[in-house]
């Protein structure tokens, strides 16, 4: 080993990573809201739609106050990875009716990937435990029909919207604890 020498600062630190994650999450929330609205305009939903393979909502308004950094980041990363895979699946499985939304779905997937990478970087820099993201609990087969893929899209975008909404609140709260 040579004599002690300083290292130049890298591009970001954990606090900046968290700021960046908040901005990316907000941006993704706006995209998801807009895409969900487009979906409702083009393909009006007949009530709420569910997909068994989607993660259950992690947080409620009542539990926000008791959030801990490791739990929030781990759960958020696992849930967003699931949504990432569902958007991937939707793009592959989408029938002709959903092809008009392909550019928006592609952009959404790319933004999700960026956010996932930022969250993982934050967890690495903090040295928090990183659970391996599971594959979707239910294997994602092709939708039964064109209407099936539309209902799936409603469910995926609706669930992602709710997840990102609590994520923004949770991350903002965590900023005060880092």
């Amino acid at each position: 080993p040579g004599p002690p020498a300083g290292s130049p600062r890298v591009s970001s630190d954990p606090r900046a990573d968290l700021d960046s994650a908040v901005l990316l999450t907000r941006s993704l929330l706006a995209d998801t809201r807009q895409l969900a609205a487009q979906m409702r305009d083009k393909f009006p939903a007949d009530g709420d739609h569910n997909l068994d393979s989607l993660p259950t909502l992690a947080m409620s308004a009542g539990t926000l106050g008791s959030l801990q950094l490791p739990g929030v980041l781990t759960r958020l990363r696992v849930d967003l990875m699931s949504y990432f895979r569902h958007v991937q699946w939707l793009r592959r499985a989408a029938g002709p009716s959903l092809k008009t939304l392909e550019p928006e779905l592609g952009a959404l997937q790319a933004r999700l990937e960026r956010l996932l990478r930022r969250l993982q970087l934050l967890m690495s820099r903090l040295a928090l435990p990183q659970a391996a993201p599971d594959q979707p609990a239910v294997p994602l087969g092709p939708p039964a029909s064109a209407w099936g893929s539309i209902r799936a899209a409603h469910a995926i975008l609706g669930g992602l919207h709710l997840t990102l909404d609590w994520a923004v609140r949770g991350l903002l709260l965590l900023k005060t604890r880092l």
């Epitope: 890298v10 606090r15 990478r117 970087l121 820099r125 040295a127 928090l128």
Partner: antibody, heavy 114, light 111 residues
Framework: EVQLLESGGGLVQPGGSLRLSCAAS????????MHWVRQAPGKGLEWVAV????????YYADSVKGRFTISRDNSKNTLYLQMNSLRAEDTAVYYC???????WGQGTLVTVSS | QSVLTQPPSASGTPGQRVTISCSGS?????????VHWYQQLPGTAPKLLIY???ERPSGVPDRFSGSKSGTSASLAISGLRSEDEADYYC???????????FGGGTKLTVL
């Protein structure tokens, strides 16, 4: 400028103990997870242990589990590695590293030999 | 035996482009964990070269680039220079260890 300065290395007999320290400056130490990584002479890098930013999580490589203890004092911006029951195969340069690791110290040599 | 596999050596002439690969398993690269690359010049400490698969820290020339696909990652160095002669290591988080794992290192020789 980020600085990580290791100390405490030296020659020790098999079965002996050493405590390494790493003094950090130039960054918010309490916001970073910290690692110890070692490199045996002429060999590659081997991760040894990690401690989370607040000290609540600690993980160890199988090769040192039960013998080494990682700790930190955020008020002193200092990382520690307590090494017990040292073996010849623990001979290496020990690096203190922060974050991904993003930053590395220059290392301190630990020689275990009779 | 390293958990991440790298070729032990690589070489190229000045100006050339060289690529170093890094392959992993289901508990690290394959599990969507990001890959980081380090450069270790002779007699010095490792230095972060690429993080999060493809991001460059400030001060790292854009001749260095990283990418990841599936269970493997790669580091590309274009416009090779004599000062690039060093050992290069890939690293990724490993869920089975709850810590980072390193590749065995690749010794790059500039001919």
């Amino acid at each position: 400028e980020v600085q990580l300065l290791e100390s405490g290395g030296g020659l020790v007999q098999p079965g002996g103990s050493l405590r390494l320290s790493c003094a950090a400056s130039g960054f918010t130490f309490s916001s970073y997870g910290m690692h110890w990584v070692r490199q045996a002479p002429g060999k590659g890098l081997e991760w040894v242990a990690v401690i989370s930013y607040d000290g609540s999580y600690k993980y160890y490589a199988d090769s040192v589990k039960g013998r080494f203890t990682i700790s930190r004092d955020n008020s002193k911006n200092t990382l520690y590695l307590q090494m017990n029951s040292l073996r010849a195969e623990d001979t290496a340069v020990y690096y203190c590293a922060a974050g991904v690791p993003d930053y590395w110290g220059q290392g301190t040599l630990v020689t275990v030999s009779s | 035996q390293s958990v991440l596999t790298q070729p032990p050596s690589a070489s190229g002439t000045p100006g050339q482009r060289v690529t170093i690969s890094c392959s992993g398993s289901s508990s690290n690269i394959w599990s969507d964990y990001d890959v980081h690359w380090y450069q270790q010049l002779p007699g010095t400490a490792p230095k972060l070269l690429i993080y999060s698969n493809e991001e460059r820290p400030s001060g790292v020339p854009d001749r260095f680039s990283g990418s990841k696909s599936g269970t493997s990652a790669s580091l590309a160095i274009s416009g090779l220079r004599s000062e690039d002669e060093a050992d290069y290591y890939c690293a990724a988080w490993d869920s089975s260890l709850s810590g980072p794992v390193f590749g065995g290192g690749t010794k790059l020789t500039v001919l």
